[in-house]
């Protein structure tokens, strides 16, 4: 009742190792680090058998396989190259993620190399199991913005892809007679989110209630250029429409809002983010040169009036955009307290245009960002957004346009986006 | 550190007013809006308003409105809540509280209440 | 205005268990909720802002979880100092709204 020798499997050992095994002896096959017992094609971690009363194993010995990890999980906006050959999926075979460049960067500049572990899973050092994440780049146009723009009242034509973040905003309410349909700008803020003026996103109501529009009545264009070839434009609809919960319809206080899509929408040269401003309540320094681009009205000399009585037409073709200073607060405070009529610039707005005008932003404009260049990450940053002025032409002398502080509202911002400012890298570094 | 510390207990008779304070301490009084909140015994929470003491604004839940009236002392950084017309559904704890950021109204500070015993 | 329920008035546990609290929003809130704790006598203290994100300082066993109407906080390994009241609050719209609260018995 001696049983036959035993050879220990290819990559695999056997314990007790004896030179001899009588009846009821057992002994345990195990495979190297990588590699698994197989047997009658189960994979497991460990075998045993038994020296049989006749002289025989209970079982043949197994065969030792090596670990596979299978094809790696892919990854959203990204790419995934092997860096062994014959694209091994194998136990200590490597991969390498990487996000589409020059739209996704990878969130904490992460190798996004993984390795497959002995227990067959892809392995990252830093993220264990995890896949890394490709965040959208933001604030880097695919064409360089000009360094200086004269003087959309006093712009120019945009070229395709100077302003990738600009949206074009339609609200169009069909419940009501006549159909009430306006339009604003926005700016994209990544593939899903939309960052707007609240007063472009409240229902026209006759009272002072702040009450968002359905999001049934909203359209976001994307990558568009001139508004009467909208085929190029990515158009989406809306999952949800937030309003800064303190916008003040009175005094336009808080003119802050959000649309999130339905879809996120395919970043590309034409379709980029605008990056988020560092938190801070002194908003862009007085001085500093901002560019605004709209389709809203690039005539000087067309009142409210007007473009009431004529709908759109008055509006701009081709996108539009204006090279403007911020103004001192304090000047721009008086300048409108100057003014009949209840004009109120608070810590949450801030100015810009020229004291004897001929550049502004105008009506249809409402919501487009105001971007500023950040030296230090070298990316255009949205520290505005197009909300007011005073009641004479666009345009006119000492008339500032009134833009929304946005560094004042990061916080709600990268809230709502599901980002607390606590939890997520500053888009642009001190 | 950020403090909120409001006035003392009082006892009002039905149809009466009352008016507490809340003095904010340890930050610049004017950045965020101070909020108030009624807390009957033993049960929930109710927002009654807010109050900006940067520029004056206030907003007031309408369950509020005619009820409660907010107001700032900018000098001592302290703001009021006075309640008219009591009747004893008003005896309750009420707080003041201040927002964690400024534009997002979730509340991280609170004053210690102030009890208000409605009864003749 | 929008309405919070705590369907949960009381809810009974052992030191060392896991709790979970709920609170649905009557309309889409997206994420803005928070949790606050009550102790007895005290005023109320924030846990979680943002539906998932906790306050500075509240140990990690407390864990926030949810968005648009269905939110819920979980008390992983529940201590002895955590019997309290919990309130939801939504930040969305005003009139801000609490949930009516929902008590933790230790047994």
């Known amino acids: 009742n001696e049983c036959p020798e035993l050879q220990p499997p290819v990559h695999g050992k056997i314990e007790p190792s004896q030179a001899k095994y009588f009846f009821k002896d057992q002994v345990l096959v195990s495979c190297d680090t990588g590699y698994k017992v197989l047997k009658d094609n189960v994979e497991m971690d460990t075998f045993q058998i038994e020296c049989l009363k006749d002289g025989t194993w209970s079982n043949k010995i197994p065969t030792c396989k090596i670990v596979d990890c299978r094809a790696p999980g892919e990854l959203e906006h990204g790419l995934i190259t092997f860096s062994t050959r014959n694209n091994l999926t194998t136990y200590k075979s490597e991969i390498k993620y990487s996000c589409q460049e020059p739209y996704y960067k990878m969130l904490n500049n992460n190798t996004g190399i993984y390795t497959c572990s002995a227990q067959g899973v892809w392995m990252n050092k830093v993220l264990g199991r995890s896949l890394p994440t490709c965040l959208p780049e933001c604030g880097q146009p695919s064409r360089s913005l000009p360094s200086l723009v004269k003087r959309i009242i006093g712009g120019r034509n945009a070229e395709p892809g100077l302003f990738p973040w600009q949206a074009l905003i339609v609200v169009e309410d069909t419940s009501r007679v006549p159909n009430d349909k306006w339009f604003g700008s926005g700016a994209l803020l990544s593939a899903s989110w939309i960052l707007t003026a609240a007063h472009v996103l409240r229902s026209q109501r006759r009272d002072t209630t702040v009450i968002p529009v359905s999001k049934e009545h909203v359209t976001v264009y994307l990558g568009l250029h001139d508004v009467r070839d909208k085929s190029g434009a990515v158009n989406s609809s809306a999952a949800r429409v937030v309003l800064h919960p303190d916008f003040n319809i009175q005094n336009y206080n808080h003119d802050i809002a959000l649309v999130q899509l339905q879809e996120p929408v395919p970043l590309g040269p034409h379709v980029m983010p605008v990056c988020l401003p560092r938190l801070e309540p002194e908003g862009p320094a007085p001085h500093m040169l901002g560019l605004v681009a709209g389709w809203g009205i690039s005539n000087p000399n067309v009142t409210v009036d007007e473009i009431i009585s004529s709908g759109t037409r008055t509006l701009s073709d081709v996108l539009q955009y204006v090279k403007l200073p911020v103004v001192p607060h304090a000047e721009c405070k008086t300048s409108y307290e100057s003014r009949s009529g209840n004009y109120s610039v608070t810590e949450n707005m801030f100015c810009a245009g020229y004291y004897e005008g001929g550049k502004d932003t105008c009506l249809g404009d409402s919501g487009g960002a105001f971007v500023i260049f950040d030296d230090l990450s070298q990316r255009w940053v949205v520290q505005g957004l197009v909300s007011w002025g005073g009641p004479e032409e666009c345009g006119s002398k000492q008339v500032y346009g009134v833009y929304t502080k946005v560094s004042n509202y990061v916080d709600w911002v990268w809230e709502q986006m599901g980002l607390p400012q606590s939890v997520v890298e500053p888009q642009v570094e001190r | 550190q950020v403090q909120l510390k409001q006035s003392g207990a009082e006892l009002v008779k039905p149809g009466a007013s009352v008016k507490m304070s809340c003095k904010a301490s340890?930050?610049?009084?004017?950045?965020?809006?101070i909020e108030w909140m009624k807390q009957n015994h033993g049960k929930s929470l109710e927002w009654i308003g807010n109050?900006?003491?940067?520029?004056?604004?206030?907003k007031y839940n309408e369950k509020f409105k005619g009820k409660a009236t907010l107001t700032v002392e900018k000098s001592s950084s302290t703001v009021y809540l006075e309640l008219s017309r009591l009747p004893s559904a008003d005896s309750a704890i009420y707080y003041c509280?201040?927002?964690?950021?400024?534009?997002?109204?979730?509340?991280?500070?609170w004053g210690q209440g102030t009890l208000v015993t409605v009864s003749s | 205005d929008i309405v919070m329920t705590q369907s949960q008035k009381f809810m009974s546990t052992s030191v060392g268990d896991r709790v979970n609290v709920t609170c649905k929003a009557s309309q889409n809130v997206g994420p803005t909720v928070a949790w606050y704790q009550q102790k007895p006598g005290q005023s109320p203290k924030a846990l979680i802002y943002s539906a998932s994100y906790r306050y500075s300082g509240v140990p990690d066993r407390f864990t926030g979880s949810g968005s648009g109407t269905d939110f819920t906080l979980t008390i992983s390994n529940v201590h002895s100092e955590d019997l309290a009241e919990y309130f939801c609050q939504q930040y969305n719209s005003y009139p801000f709204t609490f949930g009516s609260g929902t008590k933790l018995e230790i047994k």
């Open positions: 109050f900006h003491p940067y520029n004056g604004d206030s």
């Open positions: 340890g930050y610049t009084f004017t950045t965020y809006p």
């Open positions: 509280a201040r927002r964690h950021y400024a534009a997002s109204p979730w509340f991280a500070h």
